[in-house]
């Protein structure tokens, strides 16, 4: 999916008002310096591509993020403010219902969500030069 035509300001507002708080809640009890940011993005569409991938694609050691509140809200924001995104999710939703992974917070998941926090912060500062 190409995130170029999303309403970035509305997605940013949703992140600032609610998604960011859910990410913090998920990471509660973890030191902010515990994980190094290894995933980066260069512009808003690229950031959303990376955010989608890390949020919804199961990875080794962390298969369950899609059921978390921040993930549900991310999915809603993309469906509402990214043209045509919802139709790409019709079959994905069915597949996710079949998988039904239990919600388990592993160290790998905490690391992944730490990466997500970095991607979202970068999404919110699109004019900063990439380090």
């Amino acid at each position: 999916y190409d995130f170029t035509n999303c309403d970035f300001e509305k997605i940013k507002a949703a992140y600032l008002s609610t998604i960011s708080k859910d990410l913090i809640t998920y990471m509660s009890g973890t030191k902010s310096t515990e994980f190094n940011n290894t995933v980066s993005c260069s512009n808003r569409p690229h950031c959303l591509t990376e955010i989608q991938s890390l949020t919804f694609n199961p990875t080794a050691g962390c298969a369950s993020l899609a059921k978390e509140m921040f993930a549900m809200k991310t999915k809603a924001a993309l469906a509402i403010w990214c043209p045509g995104y919802s139709e790409t999710q019709i079959n994905a939703t069915q597949a996710m219902k079949k998988r039904r992974a239990a919600k388990v917070t592993t160290n790998k998941c905490l690391e992944q969500v730490s990466q997500l926090q970095g991607l979202w912060r970068r999404f919110n500062r699109p004019l900063l030069k990439q380090q």
Partner: antibody
Amino acid sequence: EEKLQQSGDDLVRPGAAVKMSCKASGYIFTDYAMHWVKQRPGQGLEWIGTFIPLLDTSDYNQNFKGRATLTADKSSNTAYMELSRLTSEDSAVYYCARMGVTHSYVMDAWGQGASVTVSS
Amino acid sequence: DIVLTQSPATLSVTPGESVSLSCRASQPISISVHWFQQKSNESPRLLIKFASQSISGIPSRFSGSGSGTDFTLNINRVESEDFSVYYCQQTFSLPYTFGTGTKLELK
């Protein structure tokens, strides 16, 4: 069974405001956005806007921005639309309709409609 | 905003005939089109979602096709209860818009 129950019909004066409700039952309220649609007598359907309880935010058709205010009370599973500065052009039937925001993505259940008549 | 134009505005048929209703979008919208039926003094009812996906409880005589800018609602052998107004709707991007409507009437 999913149901959307709208408040009753209203007769209001030009320049006044009207607030209508849409009570949802039979499903998880925050899994769906609540959309509002206007239909003037003998005319087609016009999308007014949507309130997304999951994100606690709304979005509007530019034609209604500044006059329509969409809100919801999650504790009672009720969505509201307030329309201000009414004119005769606002005489219409108003529908609420739910639409999944993490699945489904279609207006699959509608309220029965609430008629608003603007007249002096 | 995406404009949806439906044709014809009115279609006169006899029960048992099969009909096709057209919906044309002002720009490509992939398959993000849904079809609704609205009977007099009733709320709209979802018939078809995402251009061609059937809806539980809707008779199989209703089917949809199309993608991009051209979409079609087919009614195979119209029954007396089908005489009403049909609207297409796009949810590709905000603001969501509805088609102008096609009235199916008894010839």
